[in-house]
């Protein structure tokens, strides 16, 4: 019977800049899940005695638990679960509709930072503790969160990862995106998109690093076993990823319909709204399901492509099947075929 007291229980805290506080996510047999605060018969506003989660904090190498209750911002890019039974039990959980789930937050005390003594102690046989290996995604200036060149740091060494296009590394990429708390792997980025070319005036920390790594084990399950150090190469590609947690997201809206749940689809990514042009990669209803969901409506009822007889009709184009996979919208300056979508009423 799985609970957060079990030694092999895996948890993480996300959506904050500290590993010791955030939205609680747990690893069950089919992947990571966000835990709804309505679990174990609680109301979504109920605060619990935090000491009940002390094992979770311990496992994350954090201090004592300070609070356990609703997390202020619910961010649900992946699946969320409601669990039943005793507080902290994960044996009986069911998938929750994302839009009905408030996430459960946990705050643990940050671990004590130990300051080194001023005089160097005599050498001992015990090795000095090194910082745990970690990853970083370096985006181009003004670039996206969860997209960029992967840098790996082990102890005091850090650098990019050499990558050959023929490398079969899908498992590794998923592992890396997951480790970065960026969801799952979507695609490799060409270096121009990832921002490898550095401005000579950039601060030192963004200059190319002296170390380079090569993929050693693409099925690794802990960072220290994934890469081995190599001599830096002048040419060749470096690993650059786009993960599903990228921001800013493409947003959609429906305009010109007779209700909130129908209209011509418009999109934007940061700046202006513009018509979404029809694309052959989106001939299934998956794209429109996402659009309907964003409007808080029911499933898609119908969609129809409007005639683009007008050579001056302009809009934005997404080359992927789903808008949530689209980290860049392309401009189309002529013959943009708009799409009129009708979603079901939001009432159950």
């Amino acid at each position: 019977r799985l609970s957060w007291y079990d030694p092999d229980f895996q948890a993480r805290l996300t959506r904050s800049n500290s590993k010791c506080q955030g939205q609680l996510e747990v690893y069950l047999k089919d992947g990571w899940h966000m835990v709804c605060s309505q679990s174990w018969g609680r109301s979504s506003k109920q605060w619990e005695d935090p000491s009940q989660a002390s094992k979770v904090c311990q496992r994350l190498n954090c201090g004592v638990p300070l609070s356990l209750g609703p997390f202020l911002v619910t961010y649900t890019p992946q699946s969320s679960i409601i669990c039943y039974g005793q507080l902290g039990s994960f044996s009986n959980c069911s998938h929750s509709r994302n839009d009905m789930c408030h996430s459960l937050g946990l705050t643990c005390l940050e671990p004590q930072k130990t300051t080194p003594p001023t005089t160097r102690p005599p050498p001992t046989t015990t090795p000095e503790p090194t910082a745990p290996p970690r990853l970083q995604l370096v985006a181009q200036s003004g670039g996206q969160h969860c997209a960029g060149v992967v840098e790996f740091y082990s102890g005091s060494l850090g650098g990019t990862i050499s990558y050959e296009a023929q490398d079969k590394t899908q498992d590794l990429e998923n592992f890396l995106c997951n480790n970065l708390q960026c969801g799952s792997f979507l695609k490799h980025l060409p270096e121009t998109e990832a921002g490898r070319a550095q401005d000579p005036g950039e601060p030192r920390e963004h200059q190319p690093l002296p170390i380079q790594w090569k993929i050693q084990n693409s099925s690794c399950t802990s960072l220290e076993h994934c890469f081995r150090k190599i001599k830096p190469q002048k040419s060749g590609r470096v690993l650059a990823l786009l993960c599903s947690g990228f921001q800013p997201k493409v947003q959609s809206r429906l305009v010109g319909g007779s209700s909130i749940c129908e209209g011509t689809v418009e999109v934007r990514q940061g700046a202006q709204w513009a018509a979404l042009c029809d694309s052959s990669s989106a001939r299934s209803s998956l794209r429109w399901e996402e659009v309907c969901r964003e409007q808080q409506c029911g499933s898609v009822n119908s969609y129809r492509v409007l005639d683009a007889g007008d050579p001056t009709s302009r809009g934005l184009f997404c080359p992927h099947q789903k808008l949530s996979q689209c980290h860049e919208l392309w401009e189309r300056n002529s013959y943009c075929k708009k799409v009129f979508v009708t979603c079901q009423d939001p009432n159950p």
Partner: nanobody, 115 residues
Framework: QVQLQESGGGLVQAGGSLRLSCATS????????IGWYRQAPGKQRELVAL???????HYADSVKGRFTISRDNAKNTVFLQMNSLKPEDTAEYYC?????????WGEGTQVTVSS
């Protein structure tokens, strides 16, 4: 990061009125559709009303004609004017928005209607 904050709940007699507010901050101009949902003790959360940035609205059948949702885009605030309140309107009221496929909820405000 998006944050939603509800206010305006309270205790009111049947037939009375309340006005709830939902202030959004963060990537505020980004949220196209804002919804009010409610959850009574022991019941599923249910949709009350929706409004989009163009001012179009949608209401649950149980509140049509009694509740009005409106939006002040300049102040990044959505209002729910609740008139002719009934004891069955007693619930925790939550504000909800989506940014792309990501979900954001407020903490909720309690509305209690006594008979």
């Amino acid at each position: 990061q998006v944050q939603l904050q509800e206010s305006g709940g309270g205790l009111v007699q049947a037939g009375g009125s309340l006005r709830l507010s939902c202030a959004t901050s963060g990537i505020t101009s980004s949220i196209n559709v804002i919804g009010w949902y409610r959850q009574a003790p022991g019941k599923q959360r249910e949709l009350v009303a929706l409004v989009n940035s163009g001012g179009q609205t949608h209401y649950a059948d149980s509140v049509k004609g009694r509740f009005t949702i409106s939006r002040d885009n300049a102040k990044n605030t959505v209002f729910l004017q609740m008139n002719s309140l009934k004891p069955e309107d007693t619930a925790e009221y939550y504000c909800h928005g989506r940014y792309g496929i990501d979900n954001y909820w407020g903490e909720g405000t309690q509305v209690t209607v006594s008979s």
